[in-house]
Amino acid sequence: QEEDLPRPSISAEPGTVIPLGSHVTFVCRGPVGVQTFRLERESRSTYNDTEDVSQASPSESEARFRIDSVSEGNAGPYRCIYYKPPKWSEQSDYLELLVKETSGGPDSPDTEPGSSAGPTQRPSDNSHNEHAPASQGLKAEHLYHHHHHH
């Protein structure tokens, strides 16, 4: 009998609100034995695959997808899926990447926490998160959003 594959998780380092031109790394995690991790954009037809899978812990494997210099076009929802022979897993929750415009270099204002989407979490979109602190001084026009529906 085939095992039930656990849902992957997705996180972003150093976070999900990234200054224009700075780097970000998406980290996909799943069980050991994963052959391929896939990082998907909102459309399932836009994705990156990697077989560069490492063991994050005795029970977890991971793959890392780095963007060296984020642009407005990188903003939007991302999710992970993996292939553990002989089948593909379910998708992780969405993780929303926000790109913040900077005034004079890749460094600027501040917003809420929440930079990972685990197997049981909502996407990290804290406009829906009653526990997240209010944004301190970051105006909407400073962020590049990609609106989507879950």
Epitope: P14, G15, S22, L98, P106, D107, E112, S115, G118, H131
Partner: antibody
Framework: EQSVEESGGGLVAPGGSLTLTCTVS????????MGWVRQAPGKGLEWIGY?????TTFYASWAKGRFTISKTSTTVDLKMTRLTTGDTATYFC??????????????WGPGTLVTISS | ELVLTQTPASVEAAVGGTVTINCQAS??????LAWYQQKPGQPPKLLIY???DLASGVPSRFKGSRSGTEFTFTISDLECADAATYYC??????????FGGGTEVEIK
């Protein structure tokens, strides 16, 4: 009022083990990554590791194997094993997530002192 | 492994004066650098993040800047309350977290 407080420090003999507990109030651990940082007497800050909202843990290279971070709904534990005199320090628990960065800390506990001595 | 080299180890300045502290990263960390203030017997307090942005409630006397992998922290119009040890920290990723060695600021 949001707060973080460490407990469990004290005197331990070399080779022993100790578990420190960080108790949080006023916010949910399901929304914040929590880190541990230590400071030897008269020395600088040293990052130990942290735990993601959904439980994945990360450690400094020197801490892997001897230090383990875990959490419940309201506490974050740091289990330390095979302790040596070099582990004598004040241990701080800190909340990450400021400006949406995982390990940017803006809420710290007062610290708890751990002394390793025979 | 990422290393942050902070200089000087200590500095003395007069009330009303200016202090400058440097932090050199051993590899590129974009602008992912923060500065903390720590007074004796207290935990650190976040002052600056993203190299130059002030954390909430921090006065504009504190200033940060970046040039490549070199970061500079300046306190102007020094007050007695600024006597403390200051640390830089990178939050570049979960695997390269590091603090600088610290700079003790004395006010004369």
């Amino acid at each position: 009022e949001q707060s973080v407080e460490e407990s469990g420090g004290g005197l331990v003999a070399p080779g022993g083990s100790l578990t420190l507990t960080c108790t949080v109030s006023g916010f949910s651990l399901s929304n914040y990554h929590m880190g541990w940082v230590r400071q030897a007497p008269g020395k600088g800050l040293e990052w130990i590791g942290y735990i993601y909202t959904h439980g994945t843990t990360f450690y400094a290279s020197w801490a892997k194997g001897r230090f383990t971070i875990s959490k419940t709904s309201t506490t974050v534990d740091l289990k330390m094993t095979r302790l040596t005199t070099g582990d004598t320090a004040t241990y701080f628990c800190a909340r990450g997530g400021y400006a949406d960065y995982n390990i940017l800390y803006n809420l710290w506990g007062p610290g708890t002192l751990v002394t390793i001595s025979s | 492994e990422l290393v942050l080299t902070q200089t000087p180890a200590s500095v003395e300045a007069a009330v009303g004066g200016t202090v400058t502290i440097n932090c050199q990263a051993s590899q590129s960390i974009s602008s992912y650098l923060a500065w903390y203030q720590q007074k004796p017997g207290q935990p650190p307090k976040l002052l600056i993040y993203d190299a130059s942005d002030l954390a909430s409630g921090v006065p504009s006397r504190f200033k940060g800047s970046r040039s490549g992998t070199e970061f500079t922290f300046t306190i102007s119009d020094l007050e007695c309350a600024d006597a403390a040890t200051y640390y830089c920290q990178t939050y570049d990723s979960s695997t390269t977290a590091a603090f600088g060695g610290g700079t003790e600021v004395e006010i004369k």
